[in-house]
């Protein structure tokens, strides 16, 4: 056998080159046949009307033909025939790769609630061979479940991802990425998650700055509530008691002027949205006003008393459970 061919792999729409090579030949009748065993080229003549076939080279040792705009229907065995005695035949297989035509991502819900499990589907249509689908949430790879449907030598792959969403996932992209021999670089599509979550409530003492509340002083607390959607209602209440008469409520702020011991208690900021409600507590303890020491008559001694105030804040915004902020003065 002195007739040689090589298999060809080509991407749909691109150019395949078929070569029939002859070793040790003075002159020869080389013929190239298609999978239907029709003559494409007989030496340098093309009986086949398909003008996508063009002669690249014809000599006594080679018949080289290009096939442009390759389609899936061109796939198969192409035969090189050499009219010697006895005749020789060799075949080359053209394999056509088809990149996925469409990449579609579909999220079961446009908006999900934290803790909910949502279904995300990604479909890579009509590829050959079947596409491999990979999932990412941000930079983290996740595992999906793929189903392959075959139709007329083409494959449609649908991958399903079950995703339990958390509030941190809001605004994070879910990426469907395909891997396919006909695709160079990254072919991907993505959707951004929209996750609704109940408020997170945090109380901040904006006055006094040093955190020590004494009789006669003023107190200003600011309630910060973050949620999605943004909390519609932020309210202040005094736990197990009425709000002091001299307390002033202004949006998320609570002002109490001229503090006295009767103001002691737990002040709660409550916030809610369509997902749920949460609160945070501030325990107020009003200290005595500072005592004034009269100046000594004979000896001048300066005594400095340092009071250390440790403010411990404990937050818990789980639904239906008490959250507390305690300020403890040591």
């Amino acid at each position: 056998q002195n007739l040689f061919t090589k298999d060809v792999t080509v991407i749909e729409g691109e150019v395949a080159t078929i070569s029939c090579q002859v070793n040790k030949s003075d002159d020869s009748v080389i013929q190239l046949l298609n999978p239907n065993r029709q003559t494409i080229y007989f030496r340098d003549f093309r009986p086949l009307k398909d003008s996508r076939f063009q002669l690249l080279n014809f000599s006594s040792s080679e018949l080289k033909v290009s096939l442009t705009n390759v389609s899936i229907s061109d796939e198969g065995r192409y035969f090189c025939q050499l009219y010697t005695d006895p005749p020789q035949e060799s075949y080359t297989t053209i394999t056509v790769l088809v990149p996925p035509r469409n990449l579609m991502i579909d999220i079961q819900k446009d908006t999900a609630v934290e803790g909910e499990e949502i279904e995300v589907n990604c479909t890579a249509m009509a590829s050959k061979p079947a596409t491999t689908i990979r999932w990412f949430k941000g930079n983290t790879e996740l595992k999906g479940k793929s189903e392959v449907e075959e139709w007329s030598d083409m494959y449609t792959v649908t991958s399903q991802l079950m995703l339990k969403v958390h509030k941190e996932d809001d605004g994070v992209p879910v990426i469907c990425q395909v891997e396919h021999p006909a695709v160079t670089g990254n072919l991907q599509t993505q959707r951004y998650l929209e996750v609704q979550y109940k408020p997170q409530v945090h109380i901040q003492m904006t006055y006094p700055l040093q955190g020590l509340t004494r009789e006669g002083d003023a107190l200003e607390l600011t309630c910060e509530a973050i949620g999605k959607p943004q909390p519609v209602m932020v309210t202040w209440v005094r736990v197990d008691d009425e709000m002091p008469q001299h307390a002033v409520l202004s949006g998320p702020n609570l002002f109490i002027n001229n503090l006295n011991k009767t103001d002691n208690g737990t002040y709660r900021c409550e916030a809610s949205n369509i997902v749920g409600k949460a609160h945070s507590d501030y325990m107020l303890y009003v200290y005595d006003p500072p005592t004034t020491i009269p100046p000594p008559t004979t000896t001048t001694t300066t005594t400095t008393t340092t009071t250390t105030t440790i403010l411990t804040i404990i937050t818990d915004s789980r639904a239906g459970e008490e959250g507390s902020i305690r300020a403890v003065d040591h």
Epitope: D26, D27, S28, V29, Q31, L33, N36, R37, Q38, T39, F42, R43, F45, P47, L48, K49, D50, S60, F79, Q81, Y83
Partner: antibody, heavy 112, light 107 residues
Framework: EVQLLESGGGLVQPGGSLRLSCAAS????????MVWVRQAPGKGLEWVSY????????LYADSVKGRFTISRDNSKNTLYLQMNSLRAEDTAVYYC??????????WGQGTL | QYELTQPPSVSVSPGQTARITCSGD??????VSWYQQKPGQSPVLVIF???KRPSGIPERFSGSNSGNTATLTVSGTRAMDEADYYC??????????FGTGTKVTVL
């Protein structure tokens, strides 16, 4: 003007031999593929044999394979058909023809 | 055996159109040539590559080829067009296959 002139036809006994010639003129003979085509009395055309321009490769119809030999002498602008082991069914007018892009664009007048 | 099938005969009145068919499996995918052979003469190429005319062939000769059938059309037929007509094509991988031939009679 392209001209092809066959000669060498005649009467021969079954099993006998005959050599046909085709003298070409009016074109560069060495650049063209050539064929022999025959036509039995009252019948249609039948391709018999084919030869490449250099003479280095040939092709035959199954009906004559192993019995007929096509050859050419480019220095003499002549095409030949050596016919051996002749049979009654080989009786026909033999035409030589020039091949251009797979078609027979010029034919000789034939020899019987 | 590979074959290109033609009707044995076609009759046409002078000035009318004669249509000669040539049938073969997937014939429309390959180029077809047509040859005219007048009585006692050698064949002459009248159509190649389905519908092209060599120089010197009158415009009344035209060809078409699709599906499994090629057609040679002679418009405004004259007495001088009376002849045998042969189609020729590559049939599969078999080269130089001739049709069975059609005798055209101008009435």
């Amino acid at each position: 003007e392209v001209q092809l002139l066959e000669s060498g036809g005649g009467l021969v006994q079954p099993g006998g031999s005959l050599r046909l010639s085709c003298a070409a003129s009016g074109f560069t003979f060495s650049k063209y593929e050539m064929v022999w085509v025959r036509q039995a009395p009252g019948k249609g055309l039948e391709w018999v044999s084919y030869i490449v321009p250099s003479g280095g490769a040939t092709l035959y119809a199954d009906s004559v394979k192993g019995r007929f030999t096509i050859s050419r002498d480019n220095s003499k602008n002549t095409l030949y058909l050596q016919m051996n082991s002749l049979r009654a069914e080989d009786t026909a007018v033999y035409y030589c023809a020039r091949v251009k892009a797979g078609v027979f664009d010029y034919w000789g007048q034939g020899t019987l | 055996q590979y074959e290109l099938t033609q009707p044995p005969s076609v009759s046409v009145s002078p000035g009318q159109t004669a249509r000669i068919t040539c049938s073969g499996d997937r014939l429309g995918e390959t180029y077809v040539s047509w040859y005219q052979q007048k009585p006692g003469q050698s064949p002459v190429l009248v159509i190649f590559e389905d519908n092209k005319r060599p120089s010197g062939i009158p415009e009344r000769f035209s060809g078409s080829n699709s599906g499994n059938t090629a057609t040679l059309t002679v418009s405004g037929t004259r007495a001088m067009d009376e002849a045998d007509y042969y189609c020729q094509a590559w049939v599969g991988s078999t080269p130089f296959v001739f049709g069975t031939g059609t005798k055209v009679t101008v009435l």
